[in-house]
């Protein structure tokens, strides 16, 4: 799918929409550029609008092509390749390993979701950037750290 950049000319799949709400029902209007893109491009995890608005306020579907049990969603166990089943899990805070004063403020899964929606022209954000989920812990790439905790879900 072609991605619209701020200076790009609309492709055959994209059409200029001069004002808000001027796209036909089969199209989605990019917020900043006003371009109309196919509705099927909305929430497909590809950033087609230059401002990423086609990927904002999307319901996080765990595992794009696989139906997983609902009980696997937000259970602290990443089952999807992109860990999407553990994203957008409410206001559970992810407590970074190590000294929180040196790690900065806690990251929440909601902020990760926002970050994914705000990221321009990159892959979806995965939990690689998130230290832990629930009682799970993260072992940083290349190191041999890791704290012994049992799995669990924060209620």
């Amino acid at each position: 799918e072609a991605a619209a950049s701020p200076l790009s000319t609309p492709t055959s799949a994209q059409a200029a929409g001069p004002s808000s709400g001027s796209c036909p029902p089969t199209k989605f209007q990019c917020r900043t550029s006003g371009l109309c893109v196919p509705l099927t491009w909305r929430c497909d995890r590809d950033l087609d609008c230059s401002d990423g608005s086609d990927e904002e306020e999307c319901r996080i579907e765990p595992c794009s092509d696989d139906c997983i049990p609902l009980t696997w969603r937000c259970d602290g166990h990443p089952d999807c390749p992109d860990s999407s089943d553990e994203l957008g899990c409410g206001t559970n805070e992810i407590l970074p390993e190590g000294d929180a004063t040196t790690m900065g403020p806690p990251v929440t899964l909601e902020s990760v979701t926002s970050l994914r929606n705000a990221t321009t022209m990159g892959p979806p954000v995965t939990l690689e950037s998130v230290p832990s989920v629930g009682n799970a812990t993260s072992s940083s790439a290349g190191d041999q750290s890791g704290s012994p905790t049992a799995y669990g879900v924060i209620a």
Epitope: C63, D66, C67, I68, P69, L70, T71, D75, H77, P78, D79, C80, P81, D82, S83, T126, L127, E128, V130, P131, S132, V133, A136, T137, S138, S139, S140, A141, G146, Y151
Partner: antibody, heavy 119, light 113 residues
Amino acid sequence: DVQLQESGPDLVKPSQSLSITCTVTGYSITSDYSWHWIRQFPGNKLEWMGYIHSSGITNYNPSLKSRISITRDTSKNQFFLHLSSMTNEDTATYYCTRPPVVTRYFDVWGAGTTVTVSS
Amino acid sequence: DIVMTQSPSSLTVTAGEKVTMSCKSSQGLLDSGNQKNYLTWYQQKPGQPPKLLIYWASTRKSGVPDRFTGSGSGTDFTLTISSVQAEDLAVYYCQNDYTYPLTFGAGTKLELK
């Protein structure tokens, strides 16, 4: 094809710690998948121990409480099992294994390494 | 934790015989959303790691002979070997792959008469 190979000590003394390495070839452990440890006791009982996900997330069997840690060295494409306070009951064959994506069963296994706990 | 109970613990069979073994789970493994049973069967021969045979209770892994059939739903599952071959002599394990911690049955050992 992805291959897993365990390496570690044959013998560990009681109260000591165990460290086992799983070397992965044919696939990057940071690409995706979760990378698990399962052990099999002399009576053939199988126990799931825990995993490290490609993202670095780890999860453990609560039965192992605070004794277990799974870490990795991405530069060597290896992940490790650390088990502290070993007792005779930890004598087992230790397997590293990997489930297919979006599943919780196991289709790729290492050959296993047998660890005996004895003084 | 989900407890997996296999029976019998051992079976003595003759080549060509039909064999069934049971696996019961202490909690249901059927997901109502996708109607899949999260129950897996493995075969293990001496000196080897377990080998995946059947997943989702009844789906044979590619390359597994069709004499192996998995059936059942909810909490009661069965592995059937329609005509036992010498190479089938092994220990068979079932696994809960629905809920962590993942748990295994104690196994059913298939022996030759």
